[in-house]
Every structure is written in C-alpha cells, then in structure tokens.
C-alpha cells in the first residue's frame, strides 16, 4: 500500500528555521504535492506550498524555499521569525497526488523535546482520499 512519510526538523544552524521533508513510497508518478500546516489541506490547514512537476512551484510565507528533492520527495524550508512563525508543536501535512494510486496524505510535527538538528521520527499515516 502506498504511504507518505513526513519529517520535521529544526535546523541547528538557524534555530528559527524549520525543514519539512515529505516523500511518497508508492510506485506511481507524482502529479502534485501540497504542503500545509495546522492540519490537512482542506480540513482547516493553511497551504504553504504547491509543487507541480511541470508547472513549477508556488509558495506562501513563511515558506522560504520549496524544492523537488527527487521525483518522489520534496523539501520545504520555513522562516521561523515573525508573527506567522511555526512553533515546536505545529502540525505539517503533505498530500501527494499520484497516478494511478490517487491522493495520499500524512502529517508530522517536531516533538517539543527535540534538540535542534534532530528530526521528528517519520510519520507515515496515509489517508486515502478518493479525489
């Protein structure tokens, strides 16, 4: 069964900066990735970035840099300073639309006890959506 993994890490070199990494474990091809925070996309979450393999990448503050790492994984760097900055227990979600598997989503957050430079354990908690 396809799964999505999510990692969240506070960078040791920039304590106000978060890196979110997400990946798709299915064998299909990714047609769209949506990264949100505060909950799943469409269920109270706020979109941070949308990555399309052909049409490019759109991102919204406090997202600083979104990129395709590989064909099946992405990363997003968030600026942590300012009113819209994430806190340690913020939930980040990644939704992958793939062919032929459909849409899969998982969420993760940085544990409050995490040391800078350490990442949250990956949280493959797929939600099959019949989009």
């Amino acid at each position: 069964t396809p799964e999505v993994w999510v990692q969240v890490r506070m960078e040791a070199t920039e304590l106000s900066s978060f890196t979110i990494r997400c990946g798709f474990l299915g064998s299909g091809s990714i047609s769209l990735v949506t990264v949100s925070w505060g909950g799943p996309n469409g269920a109270g979450g706020t979109t941070l970035a949308v990555l399309h393999p052909e049409r490019g990448i759109r991102q919204w503050a406090p997202a600083r840099q979104a990129r395709w790492e590989t064909q099946s994984s992405i990363s997003l760097i968030l600026e942590g300073s300012g009113a819209s900055s994430p806190c340690a227990n913020t939930t980040f979600c990644c939704k992958f639309a793939s062919f032929p598997e459909g849409s899969w989503e998982a969420c993760g957050s940085l544990p409050p006890s995490s040391d800078p430079g350490l990442s949250a354990p990956p949280t493959p908690a797929p939600i099959l959506r019949a989009d």
Epitope: T13, R21, S27, W68, Q71, P122
Partner: antibody, heavy 123, light 108 residues
Framework: QIQLVQSGPELKKPGETVKISCKAS????????MSWVKQAPGKGLKWMGW????????TYADDFEGRFAFSLETSVSTAYLQINNLKNEDTATYFC????????????????WGTGTTVTVSS | DIVLTQSPAIMSASPGEKVSMTCSAS???SSWYLHWYQQKSGASPK???????NLASGVPARFSGSGSGTSYSLTISSVEAEDAATYYC?????????FGSGTKLEIK
C-alpha cells in the same frame, strides 16, 4: 538486476553535436529521476543536472545551461544527453546516474551509475 | 556555491590500519544531503554512503560515515587491499549540487 548501459565512445570535431544514450533496465524507469555527471580526464566529478523521467522537466547546473540538453524516450527506458557546438573542454567521460528516490535518511544520492561514455573533441 | 574540500588529497595505508578522510563544506550542509562515492581506476563511481552515515547496499561494515554542519568524515576501521580507490563526497543541500575533489586511498 538494475543497470544503466550507455552508448559507445565518440570522437567529434569542435562545433559538432553529440548525443549520448543511457538505457535503463531492471526497474520502473519513470519512477526515478536521471542525473548526468561529467568527469574530465584525470579530474573529479561535476554534477550537470537531472531530468524528471515522468514529466520530462530538466534542471541544469549553471555551467551546463545552453549547449546541453537532456531528453527521454520513455517507451524504451532511455535517457539522452545532447551537447551542441562542442568545445575542446567538453572532452570528458559522461555518466548517467539514477537519482535515488529519497527517504527519511537522505536525498540527492546517485544510487546506480551508468557505464560512462567518453567524448573526445579534437580538430 | 557550496565548496567541498576533501583532505588529504592522497593517503597511503597498510592493510589492517584505521583511516579517516574528511570533507569540509564552505557552508552548512544538512546531514540528509551529504553522500560519499567510491571510484576505482577506469570504473564508474559507486554510491558508498548516503545521508552522512548510511552504508549503500553491499558496502562492508568496516566503512562508516559521520559528521554534521560543515564537517564530515568517512572512516575505514581496518583497511583492505580492495579499498584502494578515490572517494568523493557530494552535497545536495543547495544548487549547484557539488562534489569534493576526492581523496585517493593507496594501499601499501
């Protein structure tokens, strides 16, 4: 077994064009990106960029913008590198290399390498 | 551009010796994005260590990788003759994705 088999050596003159092939086998071609790496004689490795084998979108390193083009023929699981207007400094071995899928332990590693194609540019 | 400086450029070791080589980055690289490759003379490179410390398939357990930030290393606990090769580090932290200049390991 997973393999990337590249086309044979090429001897070209300055100003000519070369097209190198990289045929993949043993895995689903469109699931992994394909990278290209240059190695000049006696020198180190230089990342040229990669192509998304599903969308066909290419990303080039700055030094390889312009004269270099990645392309695909997915029906035969083959990636191509074309170099236009060849220069003497293009003399090198060119490797295709599969861009690993990425995991919780890392990303951006090249987990399978091609056999290499030597291109010699000389007048 | 992130410049990766490998040292030493060339090193020589006897079988059974412990050796370490370093890869120093001009700016910080996340451990997720630091990898090592082995290339023997006349052959294609092979992925050796990925994500700083994970051994690629088939790599002997005498190899290990460690580091963070701007300083990374590859260690061989007990060198064998078959380890003679050039080892390259590579970063995928920021574009352009660069390789180090390599450390050539010779066996006495």
């Amino acid at each position: 077994q997973i393999q990337l088999v590249q086309s044979g050596p090429e001897l070209k003159k300055p100003g000519e064009t070369v097209k190198i092939s990289c045929k993949a086998s043993g895995y689903t071609f469109t699931t992994y990106g394909m990278s290209w790496v240059k190695q000049a004689p006696g020198k180190g490795l230089k990342w040229m960029g990669w192509i998304n084998t599903y969308s066909g979108v290419s990303t080039y390193a700055d030094d390889f913008e312009g004269r270099f083009a990645f392309s695909l023929e997915t029906s035969v699981s083959t990636a191509y590198l074309q170099i236009n207007n060849l220069k003497n400094e293009d003399t090198a071995t060119y490797f295709c290399a599969r861009l690993g899928r990425g995991s919780t332990t890392g990303a951006g590693y090249l987990d399978v390498w091609g056999t290499g194609t030597t291109v010699t540019v000389s007048s | 551009d992130i410049v990766l400086t490998q040292s030493p450029a060339i090193m020589s070791a006897s079988p059974g010796e412990k050796v370490s080589m370093t890869c120093s980055a001009s700016s910080s690289v996340s451990s997720w994005y630091l990898h090592w490759y082995q290339q023997k003379s006349g052959a294609s490179p092979k992925l050796w260590i990925y994500g700083t410390s994970n051994l690629a398939s088939g790599v002997p357990a005498r190899f290990s990788g460690s580091g963070s930030g701007t300083s990374y290393s590859l260690t061989i606990s007990s060198v064998e003759a078959e380890d003679a090769a050039t080892y390259y580090c590579q970063q995928y932290h920021s574009d352009p994705y660069t390789f180090g200049s390599g450390t050539k390991l010779e066996i006495k």
